[in-house]
């Protein structure tokens, strides 16, 4: 083993650590044990204990992240470096970071749960055996109603185990139908759809009817992901297996490696690759996010890397079921730490162990009727994503910019943005920022410098929003986000991280939209977000136009200031005032000489 | 003893290519990101670009990004810098250097180790 | 980018005197700065990293400290062989950034 120069350790045995965010590749559940277990084993052996919190103030800060995530040292894509750690110390020292780019399991594939069955919600075991050919995703074989199911164990013709898998046949998600299944065909705008669909919808999400009529009855749900078949790379990243599927003219109902020479697993994602050539790549066993989280947390208490291959702390990765440390990890853990004290000697217990009872007999094969229990679920959108940056304190003071006829507000044409922060009204433009505070004869007091107060930001921001209850300031400016509390700073975060799709270019803006709520708007499109949760409800997609009749379509801004709605396009604004649930246009008027009380000279 | 000897700098025409590279011993060279970083004569240091351990990933300062290819060959030891359409701007000394953190441990940072440099000259 | 700003641009003492260089950087960087001396037509070697470790081979006179946005190398008695330009560089965030320099001449 080896330690870092000078022995760096932690000077409490009682360890904090905090899980900042989610990767979507698993269940926060296990996610959530995936970690506990990992800490688990080093305290299993010192005596150390791991308790988890929910600040930054944690000593350990989990973070998933890729490419550049705030720190000095980007992440590469998928593969490679699979996850780093800072050794023992204050701030980001003793912090762990995993590579969201990986494909993230427990080390034997993706990790599916499944609901009914008789495996009682035990994850689907891939590959498994089933009527002696091996599947690597759920299939709907032995079936004649079409529900995709899985063996939990690595053999279902010897140990009958199984359970369904998330599918639209079996429950939807959110939506208005109590999460009832799909009805497929079903009739959307005049067309049948006898699949999910995105159609209608602007987010990407694939939902489905669940009565044969939506145009009629307007009842729907959302599809679950399928982990299982989502397939990567490829022509079709992101779209599912289809099963089975034709190629060569010969029926596949699992993924295949048949026409590849690297052994790769691939399946289409139409039912004919023959004739639409749609394919991608299987998903693969992933990584042990347990095994890489037990490695890096030897880094967070101060193990370098070991030169004995077996050892945890060796640099390769290793799947393995054994138990992960070996004597060598210990050594090195314990050269810090010391052993864990011996337990207090307890009196043997006289108590005679009772028989357990036996087994019940459960069914013998996938059930072919549909479970009369109706499925309940909750959403499986995108996990609310905490901040990926480390806090970065600026200096608070603000400095004062030599003054030039383009330095005073009123010579402003177009300000980059405008927020409400406090009780003033902040501008802000190409790196400065003015305030102002209505009142006779006011007159906006600046330019500063961003940079000053907020170092971490571009100079050119989208739009600028706070949010008066945790006093949290959001600043957008293109794909990305910073989150300032008082001087520190979280992100950049990429929007995806909100729940904003790919083809949100930037936020123009915010409103406040009820306790903890804000509306946020990129050009045309609106979206409720939950402040707390840091997300966006990808199903509250809705058109400004809709909800704000009479605004012009191509603001660039959108603000709150003293309980109105502002709307900006050009030097101009519509101001939006909110009567009995009737938003209205009051006022049209320029930013300048309306707003800042500029002499129109 | 740890080593770095670059070499390929020499006077090349604006527009023009070179080829640099930075042969290293007397450490586990596939363990480590490599750096390159440049002077210009008479001036401050300013990285170019990395490669990780395992050529997993590459990034580029802005000023050379599209123009510079950084690789390396870890069964020759051997690191590379690819430099097209080059600029009277690009003329400085490189260096290769080791960084001291090395894969998932990111405890230490600094360039623990570097080359004598190689000059590059774009002039016309 | 994070800017490195180092001070003075020169700084002017004799050998045995103590030197003290300073490195800003413009947002905190936690403990990831490193300080190089670069002597003419050398490469630069690296005297301490992640903020007040010498790195090996230094001598004891060397000395850093600082942390969160600002920095400083001590050199409590100089050596002739001291007299060099000096560099900080930093890798809280990315990309990495170095300071100007601050040469070090003799009185």
């Known amino acids: 083993f080896q330690t870092f120069e000078g022995d760096l350790k932690w000077h409490h045995h009682n360890i904090t650590y905090w899980i900042q965010n989610y990767s979507e590749d698993l269940p926060r559940a296990v996610i959530d044990d995936a970690f506990a277990r990992a800490f688990a084993l080093w305290s299993a052996v010192t005596p150390l204990t791991f308790t988890r919190v929910y600040s930054r103030d944690a000593d350990i800060v989990i973070q998933f992240g890729v490419a550049e995530h705030g720190d000095g040292y980007p992440f590469d894509g998928k593969d490679g470096l699979l996850a780093h750690a800072f050794p023992p110390g204050p701030g980001i020292q003793g912090d762990a970071h995993f590579d969201d780019d990986e494909l993230w399991s427990l080390g034997k594939g993706v990790v599916v749960p499944t609901r009914f069955g008789n495996a009682d919600g035990a994850a689907c075991h891939f590959p498994f055996i089933f009527e002696g050919r091996s599947y690597s995703a759920c299939t709907t074989d032995g079936r004649s109603d079409g529900l995709p199911w899985c063996s939990t164990t690595a053999n279902y013709d010897t140990d009958d185990r199984f359970g369904f898998c998330p599918s639209e046949r079996l429950y939807t998600q959110d939506g208005n139908a109590d999460g009832k299944p799909c009805q497929f065909p079903f009739i959307f705008q005049g067309q049948s759809y006898s699949a999910c669909t995105t159609d209608g919808r602007s987010d990407g999400y694939r939902w489905c009817a669940t009565t044969a009529n939506y145009d009629r009855d307007k009842l729907f749900g959302f599809c679950p992901t399928r982990a299982d078949s989502t397939v990567m790379g490829g022509n079709s990243a992101g779209e599912l297996c289809v099963f089975p599927f034709t190629f060569l003219g010969k029926e596949y109902s699992t993924c295949t490696s048949e026409g590849r020479g690297d052994g790769r697993l691939w399946c289409a994602t139409t039912s004919n690759f023959d004739s639409d050539k749609k394919w991608g790549f299987c998903p693969d066993q992933g990584y042990s996010l347990f095994l890489v989280a037990a490695h890096e947390f030897g880094h967070a208490l101060g193990l370098d890397h070991s030169s004995v291959p077996e050892a945890l702390m060796y640099p390769m990765y290793r799947f393995t079921e054994g138990p992960p440390l070996h004597k060598d990890d210990v050594n090195g853990i314990r050269h810090l730490y010391g052993p864990r004290p011996e337990p207090e000697p307890r009196p043997p217990t006289t108590t005679t162990p009772q028989p357990t009872a036996p087994p019940t007999v459960c069914p013998t094969g996938p059930p072919t009727v549909h479970p009369s229990e109706r499925p309940t679920a909750g959403p499986t959108g995108p996990p609310s994503a905490g901040p990926t940056g480390p806090p970065t304190a600026g200096p608070s003071t603000a400095t004062t910019v030599p003054l030039s006829p383009v330095d005073d507000a009123c010579n402003v044409n177009i300000f980059d943005a405008i927020a409400e922060i406090g009780n003033q009204l902040y501008l802000f433009k190409d790196g400065k920022y003015w305030r102002f505070s209505e009142g006779r004869g006011s007159r906006p007091q600046g330019p500063f410098l961003i940079a000053d107060k907020w170092p971490a930001l571009p100079r050119k921001l989208d739009s600028v929003f706070e949010e008066r209850l945790s006093k949290k300031l959001f600043f957008f400016s293109g794909r990305q986000v910073w989150v300032y509390t008082g001087a520190s700073v979280l992100g950049p975060r990429r929007l995806d991280k909100l729940g904003l799709g790919a083809d949100v270019a930037q936020v123009t803006g915010a409103l406040r939209s009820g306790r903890g709520k804000m509306l946020l708007f990129s050009g045309r499109r609106l979206w409720r977000f939950d402040v707390k949760a840091q997300m966006v409800d990808p199903r509250s997609a809705s058109e400004v136009d809709r909800m704000f009749p009479g605004v012009p379509l191509d603001t660039h801004d959108v603000f709150q200031y003293r309980e109105k709605a502002y709307f900006c396009q050009d030097r101009f604004y519509w101001r939006v005032s909110s009567r009995s649930e009737l938003n209205q246009v009051d006022q049209v008027g320029y930013v300048t000489y309306d707003i800042l009380q500029c002499p129109e000279d | 003893e740890v080593q770095l000897l670059e070499s390929g700098g020499g006077l090349v025409q604006p527009g023009g290519s070179l080829r640099l590279s930075c042969a290293a011993s007397?450490?586990?060279?596939?363990?480590?990101s490599m750096w390159w970083v440049r002077q210009a004569p008479g001036k401050g240091l300013e990285w170019v670009s990395?490669?990780?351990?395992?050529?997993?990933?590459?990034f580029y300062a802005d000023s050379v990004k599209g123009r510079f290819t950084i690789s390396r060959d870890n069964s020759k030891n051997t690191l590379y810098l690819q430099m097209n359409s080059l600029r009277a701007e690009d003329t400085a000394v490189y260096y290769c250097?080791?960084?001291?953190?090395?894969?998932?441990?990111?405890?230490?940072?600094?360039?623990?180790?570097w080359g004598q440099g190689t000059l590059v000259t774009v002039s016309s | 980018d994070i800017q490195m700003t180092q001070s003075p641009a020169t700084l002017s003492l004799s050998p045995g005197e103590r030197a003290t260089l300073s490195c800003r950087a413009s947002?905190?960087?936690?403990?990831?700065l490193a300080w190089y001396q670069q002597k003419p037509g050398q490469a630069p070697r690296l005297l301490i990293y992640?903020?007040?470790y010498r790195a090996t081979g230094i001598p004891a006179r060397f000395s850093g400290s600082g942390s969160g946005t600002d920095f400083t190398l001590t050199i409590s008695s100089l050596e002739p062989e001291d007299y060099a330009v000096y560099y900080c560089?930093?890798?809280?965030?990315?990309?990495?950034?170095f300071g100007q320099g601050t040469r070090l001449e003799i009185k």
């Open positions: 947002q905190s960087i936690s403990s990831f």
């Open positions: 560089q930093q890798r809280g965030n990315w990309p990495i950034t």
């Open positions: 007397g450490f586990t060279f596939s363990q480590y």
């Open positions: 990395v490669i990780y351990s395992s050529g997993s990933a590459t």
């Open positions: 250097a080791k960084d001291r953190a090395y894969g998932d441990y990111v405890g230490w940072n600094g360039f623990d180790y």
């Open positions: 992640d903020a007040s």
